[in-house]
Interface confidence: medium
């Protein structure tokens, strides 16, 4: 017996009625006395509703189910589920038995729209640029769990420092609270979008914050103009200073270091104490020098991924900020030179000379020269590959026709460190092998 149900889940809003469609094709002469119809929960086999011995046996499921009795004889075995709850979600099996037997399962997907988010700000008074605030976006009584996205006023995603929690109430409906921690700029719009993935329903809220500027003028924050260059694996100091006024105490100071582009928090000093590193526990302040206006940040065991711009925000009564660039570098190893072919070489032979130098950063510049210092630019192929640490291995290949004799040298330059590493190979006019045999 062929039993038909919808392939896609039946989506039902909490509190509404849902129809779980199920049908079969009755043969001529079919009467309801021959019909056994059973609806049950697919997983637990719990009885939901049944029609046997020619009559409706009623609901075994909280008295919230009904059959379409007037349509049963035409093969409509659908089940009506009233006042849908979250707990109803799942698979229901429709068993039909006449002389023969058939069954099929239909999925019920429960949903509830999320409310328009309410936005709250903490603190919400006397805000100044440079203050750290938490913006909370709350949306209620939705199902299933929501997806939450934050954006700035230009539509750019805000992904750093977001914490989202979702709590189900007794009915199984979720309240979602998403908290964005952000350092205020001169002004800004922050918006949160709460999506119900089943209903494809979006609820959004936004908040525009215009911090007050104090009339006394901004704090002047000083950082080096030039990038700070740091070797991979060493410690770097990102210098930042301000001029404290007479009577200044650390209790008045809010100091925040963050990544300029992503606004990710790196380190902070607020409420009179060091709040510690939010950046892989590799940062520290010079606490004994803070009161003198030294807001510098120490970054330990520098990695390639640290490269970029760091912003130093200083807020006392007023606010100031400045960005300092960190340029990461690593010296290239002395190049190793290989020759191919490397046996029985004669003038007129074409050879490839490979110059390899390892674990440098940033990408190298490679120059080839002959024995007189003249550049060799033709037939050079240079490739640079980064390893997991982001350090580059450089391989430069020179293809050349041997003269009577000649020296070929390769210079690998680190453009940041202005460090040159070079290697050379000398090929004489006699038949020879490389490297020369002892």
């Amino acid at each position: 017996l062929e039993v038909q149900v919808p392939e896609d889940p039946v989506v039902a809003l909490v509190g509404t009625d849902a129809t779980l469609r199920c049908s079969f094709s009755p043969e001529p002469g079919f009467s309801l006395a021959q019909l056994n119809l059973i609806w049950q929960l697919t997983d637990t086999k719990q009885l939901v509703h049944s029609f046997t011995e020619g009559r409706d046996q009623g609901s075994a499921y909280a008295n919230r189910t009904a059959l379409f009795l007037d349509l049963l004889a035409q093969g409509n075995a659908s089940l009506r589920l009233q006042r849908v709850r979250v707990a109803d979600e799942g698979s229901f099996t429709c068993f039909v038995s006449i002389r023969d037997f058939g069954s099929a399962a239909v999925s019920l997907q429960v949903a509830a729209p999320y409310s328009k988010p309410s936005m709250t700000l903490e603190p919400n008074k006397d805000l100044r640029p440079g203050d750290t605030v938490t913006i909370t976006c709350s949306s209620y009584r939705g199902y299933p769990e929501a997806e939450v996205f934050w954006q700035d006023g230009q539509g750019a995603p805000l992904t750093g420092n977001v914490t989202t929690s979702q709590m189900a109430n007794e009915q199984g409906l979720f309240d979602v609270h998403s908290v964005l921690r952000v350092v205020l700029g001169a002004n800004g719009t922050y918006s949160c979008l709460v999506r119900n993935p089943v209903l494809q329903q979006d609820a959004h809220g936004s908040i525009t914050i215009t911090p007050q500027r104090s009339p006394t003028g901004a704090v002047e924050v000083q950082v080096p103009e030039d990038p700070v260059v740091a070797l991979v694996g060493t410690d770097a100091t990102l210098r930042c200073s301000f001029s404290p006024e007479p009577g200044f105490s650390l209790a008045q100071l809010n100091l925040i270091w963050q990544l300029t582009d992503t606004k990710q928090l790196v380190h902070s000093f607020t409420e009179g104490r060091d709040q510690g590193s939010a950046y892989a526990n590799r940062t520290a302040l010079f606490l004994d020098l803070l009161a003198q206006g030294n807001a510098s940040l120490r970054l330990q065991r520098v990695r390639v991924a640290d490269e970029g711009s760091f912003t130093c925000f200083v807020s006392i009564r007023d606010f100031g900020s400045a960005a300092v660039s960190l340029q990461v570098a690593a010296p290239y190893s002395k190049p190793s030179m290989t020759l191919e072919p490397n046996k029985d070489l004669r003038p007129g032979d074409t050879v490839t000379i490979t110059c390899s130098s390892y674990r440098g950063y940033p990408e190298a510049e490679v120059f080839w020269q002959d024995g007189q210092g003249a550049p060799l630019t033709g037939n050079v192929t240079t490739s640079q590959m980064a390893n997991e640490q982001g350090l580059f291995d450089v391989h430069s290949v020179l293809r050349v026709v041997l003269g009577a004799n000649g020296t070929y040298s390769c210079l690998v330059r680190n453009p940041v460190l202005q460090q040159d590493a070079h290697g050379s190979v000398t090929i004489t006019g006699q038949p020879m092998t490389f490297p020369p045999e002892a």
Partner: antibody, heavy 121, light 106 residues
């Protein structure tokens, strides 16, 4: 009519730099961010970064960090994209595009006509 | 980085056919935009915010989806729809495009 008009085609040598301009008209230049997207011959679209002409805030795709500089001149409603240390793989059509919309939905609604940059020795 | 994978890469179709292009994101995104690019032209906005038609776009185009799976549908294809179609997200940095789906009219 809202328009973005880009500078003409450029032929450059490897290792050199190129600066492409994008002049906006028909709308308030400082109200929308300008993004730069490139397309290598026969390839898809690749985002390079954007600038907020009002605040001059920029954000770059990691791949171009350190090689691309985006600037904007409010007085002439012109955005600029400079790409340095050019290599042959940078041969592409470079587009500027206006990122428009309103919270929370945004999209590229106006594109420049594209500037072809050819890098060849 | 959220990677957008479009399928198919290429499709050859006859006029009046229905065409479906899918765009799958490597993690959940808030919405998807779609662009049409004809040879030697700049891209043009087609669908904004998953399902909203851009101004001047014929009603035979439609978009749907959520989470990680999004679809662009062209009902009753016309000859002028021969182009490459791209999906785009910016729910997470960096902004990314799909690799493109080229539609050829038979």
């Amino acid at each position: 009519e809202v328009q973005l008009v880009q500078s003409g085609a450029e032929v450059k040598k490897p290792g050199s730099s190129v600066k492409v301009s994008c002049k906006a008209s028909g709308y308030s230049f400082t109200s929308y961010t300008i993004h730069w997207v490139r397309q290598a011959p026969g390839q898809g679209l690749e985002w390079m970064g954007y600038i907020n002409p009002n605040s001059r805030n920029t954000d770059y795709a990691q791949k171009f960090q350190g090689r691309v500089t985006l600037t904007a001149d409010k007085s002439t409603s012109t955005a600029y994209m400079e790409l340095s240390s050019l290599r042959s793989e940078d041969t592409a059509v470079y587009y500027c595009a206006r990122y428009s919309g309103s919270t929370p939905y945004w999209y590229f609604d106006v594109w420049g006509q594209g500037t072809t940059v050819t890098v060849s020795s | 980085e959220i990677v957008l994978t479009q399928s198919p890469d290429f499709q050859s179709v006859t006029p009046k056919e229905k065409v479906t292009i899918t765009c799958r994101a490597s993690s959940s995104v808030s919405y998807m935009n779609w662009y049409q690019q004809k040879p030697d032209q700049s891209p043009k906005l087609l669908i904004k915010a998953t399902s909203n038609l851009a101004s001047g776009v014929p009603s035979r185009f439609s978009g749907s989806g959520s989470g990680t799976d999004f679809t662009l549908t062209i009902n009753s294809l016309e000859a002028e729809d021969a182009a490459t179609y791209y999906c785009q997200q910016w729910s997470s940095n960096p902004l990314t495009f799909g690799q493109g789906t080229k539609l050829e009219i038979k």
